[in-house]
């Protein structure tokens, strides 16, 4: 099956202090390789979450990524701050035998728009 990375929401709005879910699904787990979430693009992009076991404060996976045939790579960001605003991308990599993993597909991005906390 052809690999497609889908981020169904173009944008989400969230009040400062609240949490938000960023959705991402894949049509195939092949080729073998990790899925990572980034904010921004190019050289200035920031790694937000990797489904490879590291700990990321305030960011958790929504479903159990270790389950066989799980295609849901959505994440939850807790206690959102204005600094979390930006466009988030769910990116699929292909594992390299010795060289670094190769980025092969990305979702279209989801903008996180942070609203002032209601007083």
């Amino acid at each position: 099956k052809e690999l497609k990375v889908t981020q169904p929401e173009k944008s989400v709005s969230v009040a400062a202090g609240d949490s938000t879910v960023l959705n991402c699904t894949l049509t195939s787990l092949l080729p073998v390789g990790p899925i990572k979430w980034y904010r921004g693009v190019g050289q200035s992009r920031l790694l937000i979450y990797s489904f490879t076991g590291e700990h990321f404060p305030r960011v958790t996976n929504v479903s159990d990524a270790t389950k066989r045939n799980n295609m849901d790579f959505s994440i939850r960001i807790s206690n959102v701050t204005p600094e979390d605003a930006g466009t988030y991308y769910c990116v699929k990599f292909q594992k390299g035998p010795s060289e670094p993993d190769t980025e092969i597909q990305s979702g279209g991005g989801t903008e996180v728009y942070v609203l002032a906390k209601p007083s």
Partner: antibody, heavy 119, light 108 residues
Framework: DVQLVESGGGVVRPGESLRLSCAAS????????MNWVRQAPGEGLEWVSL????????YYADSVKGRFTISRDNSKNTLYLQMNSLRAEDTAVYYC????????????WGLGTLVTVSS | ETVLTQSPGTLSLSPGERATLNCRAS??????LAWYQEKPGQAPRLLIY???SRATGIPDRFSGSGSGTEFTLTISSLESEDFAVYYC??????????FGGGTKVEIK
């Protein structure tokens, strides 16, 4: 049929204000994000601003930030662009554009309205 | 922001000829790229989205290809109504949404 009709353009002096309107029909206006895109004489297209269907999410190009305000009235199926502190470089045809529901490209455009800023 | 560079600036061709328009992105936009046609006095028209998908009602002489940073719009056999200005637009890296500078297809 989708129709977008811009109005409100005209000739103004630098520093003055103008309010553009875009009357939409043929689709469920409140369900779609809307944009303003402009084209200076002899130049290419430049994205100006976008507003989400609910009006909660708003973005501006750096060139107009702090001077232009986008808004919408979903009960009137109308998009607005309030332009303050106008400059000669704001002279352009201003187009109203309806976004696709999945991604940020434009599936329908209006004919545009000409704004001329001149002393 | 992602800069889009279109080439050539002007393409002089005769009806019936094949037109090849290029759009290069300063960084990868995968296939998140659209093409528009603009004619004087008319609303811009969406031709292609997702780099290669034809919009509703667009004749099959228009086709798009490419991914990453290199994209092409091909008009297989030019008809009189195809002489216009064409723009590419990326919607991956945003905001801002960015357009290329345009390619004018004129009658030779």
């Amino acid at each position: 049929d989708v129709q977008l009709v811009e109005s409100g353009g005209g000739v103004v002096r630098p520093g003055e204000s103008l309010r553009l309107s875009c009357a939409a029909s043929g689709f469920t206006f409140s369900s779609y994000d809307m944009n303003w895109v402009r084209q200076a004489p002899g130049e290419g297209l430049e994205w100006v601003s976008l507003i989400s269907g609910s009006g909660e999410i708003i973005y501006y190009a750096d060139s107009v930030k702090g001077r232009f305000t986008i808004s919408r009235d979903n009960s009137k199926n109308t998009l607005y662009l309030q332009m303050n502190s106008l400059r000669a470089e704001d002279t352009a045809v201003y187009y109203c554009a309806k976004e696709n529901n999945r991604y940020r490209f434009f599936d329908y455009w209006g004919l545009g309205t000409l704004v001329t800023v001149s002393s | 922001e992602t800069v889009l560079t279109q080439s050539p600036g002007t393409l002089s061709l005769s009806p019936g000829e094949r037109a090849t328009l290029n759009c290069r992105a300063s960084q990868s936009v995968y296939t998140y790229l659209a093409w528009y046609q603009e004619k004087p006095g008319q609303a811009p028209r969406l031709l292609i989205y997702d780099a290669s998908s034809r919009a509703t009602g667009i004749p099959d002489r228009f086709s798009g290809s490419g991914s990453g940073t290199e994209f092409t719009l091909t008009i297989s056999s030019l008809e009189s109504e195809d002489f216009a200005v064409y723009y590419c637009q990326q919607y991956y890296d945003r905001p801002p949404l960015t357009f290329g500078g345009g390619t004018k297809v004129e009658i030779k």
